[in-house]
C-alpha cells in the first residue's frame, strides 16, 4: 500500500501568441480545481475508462478576477497535494491524467457552471520511494507545471511497496484474526517523525505526527503497559510465539481504522475519522463516490469525468454541508425588515409584516397610516418614518380617539376667558386686549400694536381685495392638495391590504400543502 502524490506548481497561459488572457469566461470571476486519475500500464486508454489505480479531486482554488490591463499571470491554485492512495502493489508503469476544471462564480443561484479547461495525459515509469519527478505539459494554449511521486506506507517498502519491514527492535506484531505475524524483513528505511514524545521503544508511526502502539502498550504516547504480556499463547504461556493475546484495554491499540483513518478513544470504544472517500465503522468501506448518490436534497455531485473519482456536492438554495444534508436556516439572516416575522417554507422564504409595513421583505414603510387610521375626521400626516394624526377640532390623542377640551391648554392670553364652541374655541378678551387669542394690546390712542402694513397696503387700499383673493385661492389649493393626498393614501392602503390578504392566503396554502 502507498500513496501517489501530485503537486501542481503552476497553471497558466503557455508562451507564444494566441495565449488566453484569463481562464474565466465573460460571465465573471471563476476558480480552478484539479482532478488526477491514475490507470495502470502504458496503454493508451480512453479518458472515460475507470481510474483503476485511483483518482482524487483538489480543493477549489482562490477566486480569480481578471485585471483588464495586467498581463495574465500564473493563476491562483488550490493549496496542498493531491493524494491518491493505492492499496496493492505500485505498478511502476502507469498513465497519469491531470484535468484542470473551471468553476464559474458569476451566478451561484442556479448552481455551478463548470467546464474542463485542460487535460494532460502522460504515460510514465516511476519507482515508489524515489524522489519527486518534475514535469511541464502543454494542453492547448495552457501550460501546467507539476511534480509527482509514489511513496509506500509502512510497513510496506520497496520500489513496488510489496516488501514489509519493521524497526529492528520491534517485537513481532499480530495480523488480523490473531494469526502468527507475517514474516517481516529486518531492514527498514528511516521511519517518519512521530508525534512528539511518542515512545521510541513501544510506539511507531506510519504518518508524521501520529503515535501507534505496539502490542502490549497503550496510551497516547504508548507509555502505558497493558497488564498482560503481548505474545502469550491463547491457551496459556507458550515458548513459541505462534499466537498473540487479544490487545489490551486500549481501544485504539493497533489502530483499528483502515485506509488511513485516525482512531480516537471514546468511553469503552473507539471512533474512526475516515479520509475522504472511505466510510464505515473502521473506514473499511471503499470510497464514497458520485455513484453512491452522496449529495442529498438535489445537490449536484461533481466528480470529474468518471463515476469512480472523488466527489464534491454543490448544494441547491436552502441546503449546505459537504453532502447538502443540512437545511440552511435562512431566517437566521433576518431577511425580514421592520420587525417582520420570517417563515422558511423550504422552497421559499416569506415575511409576515407588522401593520404599517409591506413588500416581500417588509421593506415598504406605510407610516402606519394603514393600520391606525385617524379617527373622528382626523387626517394622517406622513413624515420621518412615523405617523401623526392631525385631529379635527374637539378631538386629540395619537389617533384622535380622545375628546379634547379646547380650553384646557388656556389658549386665551392676558386673562381672556375661553369658551368652547362646536367649531373650536372663542376668547373673550380682557379690557385693553384684542385678537383671536387676546394677544395684541390696544394702545390708549385707539391704535392696536399690529404689525405695520407694507407701503401701499393701507386700510381701504384698492389692491387689498386682490391680495385677499390671492390668499383665498392659495388656501383652497392647499386644502385640495391635502384632500388628494388623503384619497391616494387610502387607495394605497387598500392595495397593500389586498396584497397582504392574498399573500397570507398563499402562505396558509403552502404551509398546509
Amino acid at each position: 500500500a502507498g500513496v501517489f502524490e501530485l503537486q501542481i506548481h503552476s497553471f497558466g497561459p503557455g508562451p507564444g501568441p494566441g495565449a488566453p488572457r484569463s481562464p474565466c469566461s465573460a460571465r465573471g470571476p471563476c476558480r480552478l480545481f484539479f482532478r488526477v486519475c491514475l490507470k495502470p500500464g502504458l496503454s493508451e486508454e480512453a479518458a472515460e475508462s475507470p481510474c483503476a489505480l485511483g483518482a482524487a479531486l483538489s480543493a477549489r482554488g482562490p477566486v480569480y478576477t481578471e485585471q483588464p490591463e495586467a498581463p495574465a499571470p500564473d493563476l491562483p491554485l488550490p493549496n496542498g497535494l493531491l493524494q491518491v492512495p493505492f492499496r496493492d502493489a505500485w505498478p511502476g508503469t502507469f498513465s497519469l491524467i491531470i484535468e484542470t476544471w473551471r468553476e464559474e462564480l458569476g451566478d451561484q443561484i442556479g448552481g455551478p457552471a463548470w467546464s474542463l479547461l485542460a487535460r494532460v495525459t502522460r504515460r510514465r515509469r516511476l519507482a515508489a520511494g524515489g524522489p519527486w519527478a518534475r514535469d511541464i505539459q502543454r494542453a492547448g494554449a495552457w501550460e501546467l507545471r507539476f511534480s509527482y511521486r509514489a511513496r509506500c506506507e509502512l510497513p510496506a517498502v520497496g520500489t513496488a511497496c510489496t516488501r514489509l519491514c519493521r524497526p529492528r527492535s520491534a517485537p513481532s506484531r499480530c495480523g488480523p484474526g490473531l494469526r502468527p505475524c507475517a514474516p517481516l524483513e529486518d531492514e527498514c528505511e528511516a521511519p517518519p517523525v512521530c508525534r512528539a514524545g511518542c515512545s521510541l521503544e513501544h510506539g511507531f508511526c506510519e504518518q508524521p505526527g501520529e503515535c501507534r502502539c505496539l502490542e502490549g502498550w497503550t496510551g497516547p504516547l504508548c507509555m502505558v503497559p497493558v497488564s498482560t504480556s503481548s505474545c502469550l499463547g491463547l491457551r496459556g504461556p507458550s515458548s513459541t510465539t505462534t499466537g498473540c493475546l487479544v490487545p489490551g484495554p486500549g481501544p485504539c491499540d493497533g489502530n483499528p481504522c483502515a485506509n488511513g483513518g485516525s482512531c480516537s478513544e471514546t468511553p469503552g470504544s473507539f471512533e474512526c475519522t475516515c479520509p475522504r472517500g472511505f466510510y464505515g465503522l473502521r473506514c473499511e468501506v471503499s470510497g464514497v463516490t458520485c455513484a453512491d448518490g452522496p449529495c442529498f436534497n438535489g445537490g449536484l455531485c461533481v466528480g470529474g469525468a468518471d463515476p469512480d473519482s472523488a466527489y464534491i456536492c454543490h448544494c441547491p438554495p436552502g441546503f449546505q454541508g459537504s453532502n447538502c444534508e443540512k437545511r440552511v436556516d435562512r431566517c437566521s439572516l433576518q431577511p425580514c425588515r421592520n420587525g417582520g416575522l420570517c417563515l422558511d417554507l423550504g422552497h421559499a422564504l416569506r415575511c409576515r409584516c407588522r401593520a404599517g409595513f409591506a413588500g416581500p421583505r417588509c421593506e415598504h414603510d406605510l407610516d402606519d397610516c394603514a393600520g391606525r387610521a385617524c379617527a373622528n375626521g382626523g387626517t394622517c400626516v406622513e413624515g420621518g418614518g412615523a405617523h401623526r394624526c392631525s385631529c379635527a377640532l374637539g378631538f386629540g390623542g395619537r389617533n384622535c380617539r380622545e375628546r379634547a377640551d379646547p380650553c384646557a391648554a388656556r389658549p386665551c392670553a392676558h386673562g381672556g376667558r375661553c369658551y368652547a364652541h362646536f367649531s373650536g374655541l372663542v376668547c373673550a378678551c380682557a379690557p385693553g386686549y384684542m385678537g383671536a387669542r387676546c394677544e395684541f394690546p390696544v394702545h390708549p390712542d385707539g391704535v392696536s400694536a399690529l404689525p405695520a402694513a407694507p407701503p401701499g397696503l393701507r386700510p381701504g387700499d384698492p389692491q387689498r381685495a386682490g391680495v385677499i383673493a390671492v390668499i383665498v385661492v392659495v388656501v383652497i389649493a392647499i386644502v385640495a392638495g391635502i384632500v388628494v393626498l388623503v384619497i391616494s393614501r387610502k387607495k394605497r392602503m387598500a392595495k397593500y391590504e389586498k396584497a397582504e390578504i392574498k399573500e397570507m392566503g398563499e402562505m396558509h396554502r403552502e404551509l398546509n400543502a
Epitope: I109, A291, G293, G298, P307
Partner: antibody, heavy 120, light 107 residues
C-alpha cells in the same frame, strides 16, 4: 450495447400493489443511477425518483412519497418500482432511465416503458 | 418546486423549415437542463444535456442554447423523423421537473 428491459404490461385492481422491474445490461449497473418517470396517456412526463444501486440511496419526488418505493438488486442488475394503494390515477406508462451520477445530470438511456392499468 | 414552462404547446411545420422551442424555468438553473424527443408510443430519447451539449448520435441540425432561466432548442432543416414531442427537464434541486412538452406536427 446499453439496454434497459422493463417488465410487461400489468392490470391491477384498485387498492392493490404492483412491482415493476427494469433489468439493465451492457454497462456497470452500480456506476449509474436509475430514475423512474410516469407518463399518463396523452400527457407529459413526471419524475418519480432515483435510486443509486451501488449504495441503495434513493431520492424521490415528494408527490410520490408513500405511493412509490424504489429498490435495486445488484446481483441481477435489476431496479424495481413498487406502486402501492393503486387508484385509477396510477394508470400510466412507467419508464425507467439510466441517470448519470455526476453532474451534469441527464437520462441517457430509457426502458421501453411498462403500461399499468388500474381497473375494477 | 421549479416550474418549467415550454412554448409553444404545439407547432405545425413543413419539412425543411427551422423551428425553435423555448423553455423557461421559474428560477435560475444555470445550465442544468436537458432536452428529450419522444415519438408516439416510444420512450423519450436524450437530445441535449447541460443546456448546450449534443448527446451522442444526435444529428447536428439540433442545437441547444440558453442559461439561467431561458432556454431554447433549435432544429434547422426539419426532417420527417423529427416530428414528435419535445420535453425540457431541469436538474437543479429536487424534484426534477419536466416542461409540459411541445408537439411538433407535419403541416
Amino acid at each position: 450495447q446499453v439496454q434497459l428491459q422493463q417488465s410487461g404490461a400489468e392490470l391491477a385492481r384498485p387498492g392493490a400493489s404492483m412491482k415493476l422491474s427494469c433489468k439493465a445490461s451492457g454497462y456497470t449497473f452500480t456506476s449509474y443511477g436509475i430514475s423512474w418517470v410516469k407518463q399518463i396517456t396523452g400527457q407529459g412526463l413526471e419524475w418519480i425518483g432515483e435510486i443509486f444501486p451501488r449504495s441503495g440511496n434513493t431520492y424521490d419526488n415528494e408527490n410520490f412519497r408513500g405511493k412509490a418505493t424504489l429498490t435495486a438488486d445488484k446481483s441481477s442488475s435489476t431496479a424495481y418500482l413498487e406502486v402501492r394503494s393503486l387508484t385509477s390515477e396510477d394508470s400510466a406508462v412507467y419508464f425507467c432511465a439510466r441517470t448519470t451520477v455526476f453532474a451534469p445530470y441527464y437520462f441517457d438511456y430509457w426502458g421501453q416503458g411498462t403500461t399499468l392499468t388500474v381497473s375494477s | 418546486d421549479i416550474q418549467m414552462t415550454q412554448s409553444p404547446a404545439s407547432l405545425s411545420v413543413s419539412v425543411g423549415e427551422t423551428v425553435t422551442i423555448t423553455c423557461r424555468a421559474s428560477e435560475n438553473i444555470n445550465s442544468n437542463l436537458a432536452w428529450y424527443q419522444q415519438k408516439q408510443g416510444k420512450s423519450p430519447q436524450l437530445l441535449v444535456y447541460a443546456a448546450t451539449n449534443l448527446a451522442d448520435g444526435v444529428p447536428s441540425r439540433f442545437s441547444g442554447s440558453g442559461s439561467g432561466t431561458q432556454f431554447s432548442l433549435k432544429i434547422s432543416g426539419l426532417q420527417s423523423e423529427d416530428f414528435g414531442s419535445y420535453y425540457c427537464q431541469h436538474f437543479w434541486g429536487l424534484p426534477w421537473t419536466f416542461g409540459g412538452g411541445t408537439k411538433l406536427e407535419i403541416r
